[in-house]
Amino acid sequence: EKLPKAPVITTPLETVDALVEEVATFMCAVESYPQPEISWTRNKILIKLFDTRYSIRENGQLLTILSVEDSDDGIYCCIANNGVGGAVESCGALQVKMKPKITRPPINVKIIEGLKAVLPCTTMGNPKPSVSWIKGDNALRENSRIAVLESGSLRIHNVQKEDAGQYRCVAKNSLGTAYSKLVKLEVEVFARILRAPESHNVTFGSFVTLRCTAIGIPVPTISWIENGNAVSSGSIQESVKDRVIDSRLQLFITKPGLYTCIATNKHGEKFSTAKAAATVSIAEWSKSQKDSQGYCAQYRGEVCDAVLAKDALVFFNTSYRDPEDAQELLIHTAWNELKAVSPLCRPAAEALLCNHLFQECSPGVVPTPMPICREYCLAVKELFCAKEWQAMEGKAHRGLYRSGMHLLPVPECSKLPSMHRDPTACTRLPYLDYKKENITTFPSITSSRPSADIPNLPASTSSFAVSPAYSMT
């Protein structure tokens, strides 16, 4: 009969290296009598015999982990006890070796130029994988802006347009290499105007093209504003090439305007906007490209019918595509503006404008317009419409206005010929000869300080006294 013998572990446990999903075995050979009970612990926690992840054989001397998981690493101990003497224990470590695995791969990123971008790449593996990045087909080099963090993430400071592209991270250890899917870094750029529209000074009825070029990512949209309102007239043509949008606004100019080009693009829920403005002003119509060339015809319009002399030939300026329509449209626009002026000023201004836009045809070999006599122009400016004219000139340097006389095609009185020099070289305004009650009923005008610029108006069959300087008698 054998003598009782306390357990002795003849093969101490060793460190076991195992790959994930592979089999790992610990052997705990024990000599003893009677036969010992062998139990196993992992990190001091008893492994239950019925745990199907383990197989315990050879009377408990062999522990097999059937499919190693990364969470199985730790200290495994076998404890043998047969009641003779004390229990004995031997321990060994399980090191789960793991091919690289990317646990948090990078994702597509949209980032605004100049900001910081971080592309994540969290990995697992044993040994710990090293992480590198590929952009396009080439390994990405780190520099002062671009760094691979300890975590494996890629950080790009002050993102530039050229950083846009496809990226993937690479995790590598002695057991293998893992690649993330390709992700896209899109660099968004705030809308910026490359070419602002140019201001123009044109004749009434001209066609003008305003051009505005903008860049941005995504490609901006361009809208146009005319005097604060969305453009209603004209047509817009757009083309896009290499992230640059070129917008051309075609206009038929019948009034001055402030035109604003607005380039907008969207970044997530936010928008970026860039603006540029240009003015289109109307040159005094008689200073046209045709050097006052045109033809003479009877006035067939409506607006000036009551103002112009019956059956007189008036000058139509062929620098306009359709002179009669263009000049009528201009006077129509002017007429609406006159609604804002005083009852004293309005009829005088109407007479001035009609005779300025539809000048009497000067007889001669080549048709030329006969301008208004300076004295009559000045009478309207300094008598009938003194208040309005002053307001207009006071604000002239401030650009565009919405009411009164500022948008009207008024002549420059000082540039008109004087009737005293050549009475046949200029046109009189019948209104000033006929409507004396318009002046005499306004005492404030008759006492106004006479202008040194205004010589006496001519004698007339229906003359009227104004003030000494304006005397028509």
Epitope: Q289, Q293, Y295, T318, P363, V365, V366, P367
Partner: antibody, heavy 121, light 107 residues
């Protein structure tokens, strides 16, 4: 409807003065906005403007012919005339009178049928 | 003096478009007139002030004038359009100038 009609000798000797008259009917030569020109066309060649008289009697001449050309008018007969001195065979041409109208940008809207003038000895 | 240049001849197929040009220094700043002349007849004005048609002239006659070229366009040329065509301008010195003329042949 205005009508213009040229008249004058068909043959002129070299070095002489060529005189042609244009009679205007259906409108006055003193009417504002009209002018009256002489234009000629050598055989097989293009048109050449020679000069103009305006409604008020003022005259303007082609720079190349200025020294030899004179245009006058007779308002009582509603006629205007061309005088071209020191003619040479190069002055052989069909001579037209025409009305220029301010209503049509001073274009020539009425032409005579033309009169053939030959300069030959 | 002011020179107006026209090509001597232009051919066009029946009912096709003919373009006759008149070149002159900055002619676009002047009013251009066009005249049609058939053999043995006096000229007839077909366009004035660059593009305006006198009454009685068919709509197929149109014109344009910009830069250094004035153009007479006959859209859908007819056999009766075969003629010589002359351009004409007035200069600022009250001188009239004619182009050398273009003979239009309708094939």
């Amino acid at each position: 409807q205005v009508q213009v009609q040229e008249s004058g000798p068909g043959l002129v000797k070299p070095s002489q003065t060529l005189s042609l008259t244009c009679t205007v009917s259906g409108g006055s030569i003193t009417a504002r906005y009209y002018s009256w020109s002489w234009i000629r066309q050598p055989p097989g060649k293009g048109l050449e403007w020679m000069g103009v008289i305006a409604y008020d009697g003022s005259t303007y001449y082609s720079p190349s012919l200025k020294s030899r050309t004179s245009i006058s008018r007779d308002t009582s007969k509603n006629q205007f005339s061309l005088h071209l001195s020191s003619v040479t065979p190069d002055d052989t041409a069909v001579y037209y009178c025409a009305r220029g109208s301010s209503r049509v940008a001073a274009a020539f809207d009425s032409w005579g049928q033309g009169t053939q003038v030959t300069v030959s000895s | 003096s002011y020179e107006l240049t026209q090509s001597p001849s232009v051919s066009v197929a029946l009912r096709q478009t003919a373009k006759i040009t008149c070149g002159g220094d900055n002619i676009g700043s002047k009013n251009a007139q066009w005249y049609q002349q058939k053999p043995g007849q006096a000229p007839v004005m077909v366009l004035y002030a660059d593009s305006r048609r006198p009454s009685g002239i068919p709509e197929r006659f149109s014109g344009s004038n910009s830069g250094n070229t004035a153009t007479l366009t006959i859209s859908g040329a007819q056999a009766e359009d075969e003629a010589d065509y002359y351009c004409h301008v007035w200069d600022s010195s009250t001188n009239a100038w004619f182009g050398g003329g273009t003979h239009l042949t309708v094939l």
